[in-house]
Interface confidence: medium
């Protein structure tokens, strides 16, 4: 089997003129992509991969959020030479959230990494943007996390700050196939610029004190208190999912034109941001991009 | 049918300055990888430059790099390519070619640009 | 000096077989980058003829065929005509210089 073969980190690893071909291990007999975009309320930026891949054919899309941070996935197996070409893989102008200035700043200011390196989204480097509310949402947190995507045998991963929902979440995280978003929040201008210690204690949870010994006629009742690690994902009536690629529209023109519907429009996109003027762009629109005209 | 029809080339001196665009039609110019590629007269082609369908992401030949600049505007289906400290070896036809599968599969019928003292 | 290397020329006559050659390296061809070919008749732009190392755009006659290996490329033209007569330029993406890099160029001359 011979399968295209990419990797995107925010970048251009997967832009039309790069692509490549791999022949697959025996006893490989499915060529598989992945996208998996992430936009916060300053942006957004996709990872990629393409390659051969393991399993059975078929699609799986999904879409996600965690604490007003919207993930999108879509994954597509196929068993024919070079069919993994469907997917729009290449990374959407990081651009901002169209009207966002028509939202007032709400007082707080967080550290944004929308498609930064590691390197460039260290410690106080990365820019600082201003916090609003969108959608009926307040976003009074700063987040830092980690989104990563797996596929083809491939890892890539990526850090993410940005304004959020929630002041106080710990090591929450929301997955999709082979995709996982993960971090945490803090409550406080620029509070995230690392947060990869945080331990569970937040204002939110009554510290822990020691109790005077029981007397012998009580009994010391203490309030359980859980912490959740797995952000609820929402209800399927919000929570969109992409749709699957066989049912995007095919590309313009004539046959062999199929020009690269580059950056990621997620179509659909998490409830939340419906009045950001950037929903309903993600990720992969534009048709099949596979060579539809062998043999002729 | 896709078109891509460029313009702005001509006779300039070295260190001189020239625009040349690419208006576009037939294809959803937005949703295109568009680059320009060049040939000196009777030599081969030389890639140039690329921009990704947002303008996000620009590449340049190492031999233009700081002295040309890629745009597009959306809005107008054209492509551009602003091009300064102009020298003789930029002398060439200047094709602007769309990126399919790929690869460059619609391609403009060029424009002259002459650099010369 | 091209970062793919073509043969300068090519020759044949109506209704023979020609191959044209492209010698890569390990940061294009061989880096598993696909190869395209042009076809470009004189006085005129370049036209795609063969992408993705072995597919034909539609409308292009299946006389012509491309294949790959290691970090070369071929075009093979089968049954020649007057009308092939042009200069045939391959194509790939190369790591080092991060852009697109064509060869040379083979002018084809049908005798």
């Known amino acids: 089997l011979e399968c295209y073969s990419c990797v995107q980190k925010a970048d251009d690893g997967c832009s039309p003129n790069k692509m490549k071909t791999v022949k697959c291990a025996p006893g490989v007999d499915v060529c598989t992509e992945a996208v998996g975009a992430v936009e916060t309320i300053h942006g957004q930026f996709s990872l990629a991969v393409r390659g051969c891949g393991s399993g059975l054919p078929g699609k799986n899309d999904r879409g996600l959020d965690l604490h007003g941070l919207l993930a999108f996935i879509q994954l597509q197996q196929c068993a024919q030479d070079r069919c993994n070409a469907k997917l729009n893989l290449t990374s959407r102008a990081l651009d901002p959230a169209g009207n966002e200035s028509a939202y007032p700043p709400n007082g707080v200011e967080c550290y944004s990494c929308v498609g930064l390196s590691r390197e460039a989204c260290q410690g106080t480097s990365p820019p600082v943007v201003s916090c609003y509310n969108a959608s009926d949402h307040v976003y009074k947190g700063c987040f830092d996390g980690n989104v990563t995507l797996t596929a083809a045998n491939v890892t890539v991963s990526l850090p993410v700050r940005g304004c959020v929902q929630d002041e106080f979440c710990t090591r929450d995280g929301v997955t999709g196939p082979g995709f996982t978003l993960s971090g945490s929040c803090c409550q406080g201008s620029r509070c995230n610029s690392d947060l990869r210690n945080k331990t569970y204690f937040s204002p939110r949870i009554p510290p822990l004190v020691r109790l005077p010994p029981p007397e012998p006629t009580t009994v010391a009742s203490t309030t359980s208190v859980t912490t959740s690690t797995s952000a609820p994902v929402r209800p399927t009536s919000t929570t969109k999912p992409m749709p699957a690629p066989t049912s995007q529209t095919p590309r313009q023109g004539v046959e062999h034109e199929a020009s690269r519907d580059e950056e990621p429009r997620l179509t659909g996109g998490a409830a939340g941001h419906q009045d950001r003027s950037n929903s309903g762009q993600y990720p992969a629109k534009g048709g099949p991009q596979q060579p539809h005209n062998k043999g002729c | 049918e896709v078109q891509l029809l460029e313009s702005g080339g001509g006779l300039v001196q070295p260190g001189g300055s020239l625009r040349l665009s690419c208006a576009a039609s037939g294809f959803t110019f937005s949703n295109a990888w568009m680059s320009w590629v060049r040939q000196a007269p009777g030599k081969g082609l030389e890639w140039v430059s690329y921009i990704s369908s947002s303008g996000s992401t620009i590449y340049y030949a190492d031999s233009v790099k700081g002295r040309f600049t890629i745009s597009r505007d959306n809005s107008k289906n054209t492509l551009y390519l602003q091009m300064n400290s102009l020298r003789a070896e930029d002398t060439a036809v200047y094709y602007c070619?769309?990126?399919?599968?790929?690869?460059?599969?619609?391609w403009g019928q060029g424009t002259l640009v002459t650099v010369t003292s | 000096q091209s970062v793919l290397t073509q043969p300068p020329s090519a020759s044949g006559t109506p209704g023979q077989r020609v191959t044209i050659s492209c010698s890569g390296s390990?940061?294009?061809?061989?880096?598993?980058?696909?190869v395209h070919w042009y076809q470009q008749l004189p006085g005129t732009a370049p036209k795609l003829l063969i992408y993705?190392?072995?597919q034909r755009p539609s409308g292009v006659p299946d006389r012509f065929s491309g294949s790959k290996s290691g970090t070369s490329a071929s075009l093979a033209i089968s049954g020649l005509r007057s009308e092939d007569e042009a200069d045939y330029y391959c194509a790939a993406y190369d790591d080092s210089l991060n852009g697109p890099v064509f060869g040379g160029g083979t002018k084809l001359t049908v005798l």
């Open positions: 390990s940061s294009n061809i061989g880096a598993g980058y696909v």
């Open positions: 993705d190392n072995n």
């Open positions: 070619a769309r990126e399919g599968l790929w690869a460059f599969d619609y």
